[in-house]
Structures are given as C-alpha cells and as structure tokens.
C-alpha cells in the first residue's frame, strides 16, 4: 500500500503525459486523479513508466473500480494488463472482440499466461459459444488454443466456426478432442466435393469412425502416412487390406517403413498374410493362410 500523502504544490496532474515518469511513487498516488487516468488510459502505453509506477496506476484504478474495470478502460490497458491477476480479470465483463485482440496483442509471442487464459474464459463464457470470429482471433494468437479446451468446452463450438481452424491448430489435440471436433467438421464441410472435402477434413480424421474411413477409401483420396497414423486404432483395425490400399494410394508403400508403430503394427497383425503379400512390401506378421479368425469380443457379447 502506498501511504496517503498530499500532492505537492504545482504537481497536480492535469493530463497523463511524459512528465509523470519523473514522479516518485507517492507523488503519482497523490497527484494523479483516478478518474483522469481512466479517461486517458490510451496514453499510458506511450509513456515509459517503470514497473513500480505501473503498480501505483493499477492501485488507483482498483480503488476507482472495486467491482471490476469497465470495458472502456480494459480496452486501453496495454502493458498494464500484464500487472493484472486472474482474480482481477474474473471481475471483468469483456464483450468486444476488439478489446480481446488489444489485450492478446500485449502478450503476443509469449506462452498463454494464467491472465490470458482467464481473460479468454471470461470472454467465451460471456458470448455463450466459440463463434467463428473469436476462434479466428484466438487461434491466430495461440495456434494450440483449441487443443487446450476440454471435450465439454469443445462441444460449444458451432460447426460454422470449424472453417476458421487450420491444420496446425489441431497438432496437439488428443483423440477425445478430435472425437468431438470431427462430427462438427463433417457437418461444416458436407457440401464440398470429394477432393476439396478431403483437404478440409484431413486434420480432423483422428476422430473418424471406421465407416467414414471405408467411405473415404472409395474416393481416391491418397491419404498420407502421417495422417493415417493419427487415426483411431479402433477405427483402423477393421479396415481390409484393399481398403487401406485404396485409402493410402501411393502412400501405402510407407507401411513398410512404419510397420513397428501403431496403428500400423496392430493393423498388420489383424490381416491375412495372403492379403498383405498383395501390397508388395514384404510385410510379415499377418494371420497365416488357413487359420480361422474368431472375434472373441462378439462371442462375449452373445453369451
């Protein structure tokens, strides 16, 4: 706490300007009117205040707005935003995308801080859903943002917002998240033609069920191996050799190079050796010819 002291004669600030950088902390506290500061917040960013001086300015705003800052002030916080705690931010009601952008810009190039996470959470909750413009903004600043959300949070993403998602935005998503996003993407891109559809849906296929993969295999999509290996193992295992060959096209050759990794390894073990031989890759480990395959999970379900 800065001690309450009277402002020295002639030092009362009439506006927020560069002369204030020469004020001691107690002088800023005594001589800068909080209401003036609030109306001239946009000037603070242009003035090279020290961290200690910024602490004083924050303190003045906290006193003026104990229930939380109004958006007119929040939008112009600039570097003062870095002084805010998640507790401070939870008091705010941020509704403007411009305000959100302005504050994200302050933190640009850094990891998502607890303050930013709280700000985004408040903003999205206030809007009720992750609309396309918000998603566009958030993924532009934080490509991994989408994958930081829980499956429950992702369920509020409307299919229309999926158009804003870039492949790199999904790099760190796990299968549970893709399970939620894939049906939305399927819906969003449903009116596109075959090759265009595949380009758009490709990044989301980690959430695709077997029947959709079978359908894709009939469309000459030539899925690359990196995409294939991100598919759900349980979705890949039922695919036949012919279906995988059609799905991967020329990239099926790469199964040999990746035969020790899942889901390739598990898939190989499920195929008949005769069928694997048709791939011309020398893949081994398939079911020997003449052996009968029993699906024990089906047997248990029947008993």
């Amino acid at each position: 706490e800065v001690e309450k002291t009277a402002c020295p004669s002639g030092k009362k600030a009439r506006e927020i300007d560069e002369s204030l950088i020469f004020y001691k902390k107690w002088e800023l506290e005594a001589c800068v009117d909080a209401a003036l500061l609030a109306t001239q917040m946009d000037r603070v960013n242009a003035i090279p205040f020290t961290y200690e001086q910024l602490d004083v300015l924050k303190h003045k705003l906290d006193e003026l707005y104990p229930q939380g800052y109004p958006e007119s002030v929040i939008q112009h916080l600039g570097y003062l935003f870095l002084k805010m705690s998640p507790e401070d931010i939870r008091k705010w009601n941020v509704t403007s995308l411009e305000t959100l952008k302005a504050l994200l810009e302050v933190n640009k190039g850094h990891e998502m801080s607890p303050q930013v996470a709280t700000l985004i959470d408040r903003f999205v909750k206030g809007r009720g859903q992750l609309d396309k413009d918000t998603l566009d903004t958030l993924t532009a600043f934080y490509p991994g943002y989408l994958c930081s959300l829980s499956p429950e949070e992702l369920s509020s993403v409307p299919p229309s917002s999926i158009w804003a998602v870039r492949p790199q935005d999904l790099d760190t998503c796990d299968p549970r998240q893709l399970d939620v996003l894939y049906p939305k993407a399927r819906l969003a891109f449903q009116n596109m033609n075959g090759s265009e559809y595949f380009v758009k849906i490709q990044s989301f296929l980690g959430g695709a069920p077997t029947e959709d993969l079978k359908a894709l295999s009939q469309q000459n999509v030539s899925m690359d191996l990196a995409t294939f290996m991100k598919l759900r193992t349980d979705a890949v295992l039922p695919l036949t050799v012919a279906e995988v060959q059609k799905l991967l096209g020329p990239h099926v050759e790469g199964l040999k190079a990746e035969e020790r990794h899942r889901p390739v390894r598990d898939w190989i073990l499920r195929q008949r050796q005769d069928d694997l031989d048709t791939l011309g890759l020398g893949l081994q480990g398939g079911i020997p010819n003449g052996y009968l395959v029993l699906d024990l999970s089906m047997q248990e379900a029947l008993s």
């Epitope: 030539s222 191996l225 990196a226 060959q245 990239h251 050759e253 790469g254 990794h261 011309g280």
Partner: antibody, heavy 117, light 113 residues
Framework: EVQLVQSGAEVKKPGASVKVSCKAS????????MHWVRQAPGQGLEWMGN????????YYNERFMSRVTMTVDKSTSTVYMELSSLRSEDTAVYYC??????????WGQGTLVTVSS | DIVMTQSPDSLAVSLGERATINCKSS????????????LAWYQQKPGQSPKLLIY???TRESGVPDRFSGSGSGTDFTLTISSLQAEDVAVYYC?????????FGGGTKVEIK
Amino acid sequence: EVQLVQSGAEVKKPGASVKVSCKASGYTFTNYWMHWVRQAPGQGLEWMGNINPSSGDSYYNERFMSRVTMTVDKSTSTVYMELSSLRSEDTAVYYCARSGGLWLAFWGQGTLVTVSS
Amino acid sequence: DIVMTQSPDSLAVSLGERATINCKSSQTLLNSVSQNNYLAWYQQKPGQSPKLLIYFASTRESGVPDRFSGSGSGTDFTLTISSLQAEDVAVYYCQQHYRTPYTFGGGTKVEIK
C-alpha cells in the same frame, strides 16, 4: 547383390512413344516397389511415379498422368515405363529406383532418351 | 505439391573442412506419431546414378561413411560432411517422401576449394 539393369539409349521423334525396361535381381522382386525418376540434361531430379510389383498397381505424378504407363512382368522380374506423345523437353536420363521403404535405396544405371526431329 | 528449396546452389570447401547443405520444405515432413521425418539425401557423382546417403532425415544408409550426417526436423534440414574428401565431389539432393508427388530439391554442387 541388388542390381537394376536398364535398357539402352533411345532416340525418338516428337509424338512417338518410348518404353524403357528395368530388370531386377539380387532380392525378392515382389517385396519392394519400383519408382521412376528422370533427369533432364544438366537439371535436377523429377519423380514420375511408382509401381507395386506384386499387384501391378501404379501411381503417377499428375504431370505425366495422361502420358505414362508403368507395368511389371513378374516372370522376368522386370518393370517397364512407357512415355507417349514425346516432345523435346522429354529428353532426359530415365532411372528406375527400388524403394527401401519410401526412400530410393538402389538405382539403375539410367537410360538416355533423346527426342529430336 | 511440396516445394523443396536447397541452399546454397554450389559450395567450394577445402579438403578436410566441413561442408553444410541446407534443405527447406514448404510444409512439415514430420510424422508426429512415429517422430520420423520423411526426408532423404542423395549423392550424385559426375556421370553416375544417384546414391542414397540418408533417410528419415538422420539415419545413415549402410555403407555410407560416418562423415556424412543428417539433421533437422519439420521443415528445416541439413546435410553435413564433417571432413570433405576428394571423392565427395558431387551434386547432393534432398527429397521429401511425405506426400506424392515426391519432390527433390534443386541440388547443391560441392567442389574442392
């Protein structure tokens, strides 16, 4: 020892076709895909396509899609690459190359195809 | 198509010195599941067929001298010849085998200074 022996040099007129062969030995022929790559004089390498020697399925670079055909004769462990509607810019050395997984582990000696009127 | 950009176009290095060739792809070549980078390096000596040196960006093909090494991940890759020998005079190519059409870099000519 893996060996890929290609057919000899060819001189063709524009509009004609050429068929280059690549005879493989020293390994199980049906266990490795074969690729074709070409190199114009003084230029870099260009991938043309690949073929599964077990099934005969082939895949082509779209640049050559309408003009190239790759085939296989398992009885002689030979793959063929036929390029039709030849033009002067098809003058190049054509290589067959055996896959090592995805990369090209063994290369033939190359076949020079000259297209000239 | 994935574009492969090699630099420099040519390189003159003294015998016994290090030669470094760079290759940049227009999109990632990393398989995030297996952590393999789908990039190979080839050496082509004058009048000869290309020869495989490195695959998966850093795995040396058997029989290739250990002065050749590959590094990098994602979109940026490097081939290093730690101590250049006279027999290393050649053109070196990188190639992506992530997605068809498989594409090559323009080549880097390595000569003796």
